[in-house]
Amino acid sequence: HSDGIFTDSYSRYRKQMAVKKYLAAVLGKRYKQRVKNK
């Protein structure tokens, strides 16, 4: 996940937001799976 050559604040911000969104989706899936398995 190198995300290109840009290191300016906007590129860093968009990358950080993408990571947060991705983690939220992954954690959300795991939570739903746990609830489903109970």
């Epitope: 996940h1 995300d3 290109g4 840009f6 990358k15 937001m17 993408a18 991705y22 989706a25």
Partner: antibody, heavy 114, light 111 residues
Framework: EVQLVESGGGLVQPGGSLRLSCAAS????????MGWVRQAPGKGLEWIGD???????DYASWVYGRFTISRDNSKNTVYLQMNSLRAEDTAVYFC????????WGQGTLVTVSS | AAQLTQSPSTLSASVGDRVTITCQSS????????LAWYQQKPGKAPKLLIY???TLASGVPSRFSGSGSGTEFTLTISSLQPDDFATYYC???????????FGGGTKVEIK
């Protein structure tokens, strides 16, 4: 040569769907965020949205869920799925690399008409 | 969505002229500097000139420069060359990417 090539454009009826492809060559697309931009004939540029290296997406507020951006890193390709197409969606559609759109494809023309 | 207003919409100039194009945003861009400038020639894809308000993209001649902050930005061509007759667009990046938008464009034509 480092380049992006769009394909999948053509004539579609109002209400129809179309999937555009953007194939990368000369670099690994998996390392970059990718965006889509369109340009209606004789008009200006319009930002559609982008997809991160993680596969998360952001869209312009006017998209309203009609368009979906996805990627297949194994095929070095990004896609734009367009549904419920209208005459006003007639445009040249460009894909571009990273959040600053630093490398562009040549575009593919989508015509929505009955 | 944000509104980006470019002025003028058309600009007539001669080779060697100093040219200035402005881009005004209805709201502040991210970190006050998330703005890019592009050049487009008829039938061609746009080309990135400037990003982060003032950083010159790779391979772009130094006669192009960008300035501004917050809601007001400027693209300057210090000495217009024959290859510079084209349409120029600004693109704003915002805290909420749903607001991202291009300006309406400025056509630089031969006087």
């Amino acid at each position: 040569e480092v380049q992006l090539v769009e394909s999948g454009g053509g004539l579609v009826q109002p209400g129809g769907s179309l999937r555009l492809s953007c194939a990368a060559s000369g670099f690994s697309l998996s390392s970059y965020a990718m965006g889509w931009v369109r340009q209606a004939p004789g008009k200006g540029l319009e930002w559609i949205g982008d997809i991160s290296t993680y596969g998360t997406t952001d869209y312009a507020s006017w998209v309203y869920g009609r368009f979906t951006i996805s990627r297949d890193n194994s095929k070095n390709t990004v896609y734009l799925q367009m549904n419920s197409l209208r005459a006003e969606d007639t445009a040249v559609y460009f894909c571009a690399r990273d959040y600053w759109l630093s490398l562009w494809g040549q575009g593919t023309l989508v015509t929505v008409s009955s | 969505a944000a509104q980006l207003t470019q002025s003028p919409s058309t600009l007539s100039a001669s080779v060697g002229d100093r040219v200035t194009i402005t881009c005004q945003s209805s709201q502040s861009v991210y970190d006050n500097n998330a703005l890019a400038w592009y050049q487009q020639k008829p039938g061609k894809a746009p080309k990135l000139l400037i990003y982060a308000a003032s950083t010159l993209a790779s391979g772009v001649p130094s006669r192009f420069s960008g300035s501004g902050s917050g809601t007001e930005f400027t693209l300057t061509i210090s000495s217009l060359q024959p290859d510079d007759f084209a349409t120029y667009y600004c693109l704003g990046g915002y805290y909420d990417p749903a607001d991202n938008a291009f300006g309406g464009g400025t056509k630089v034509e031969i006087k």
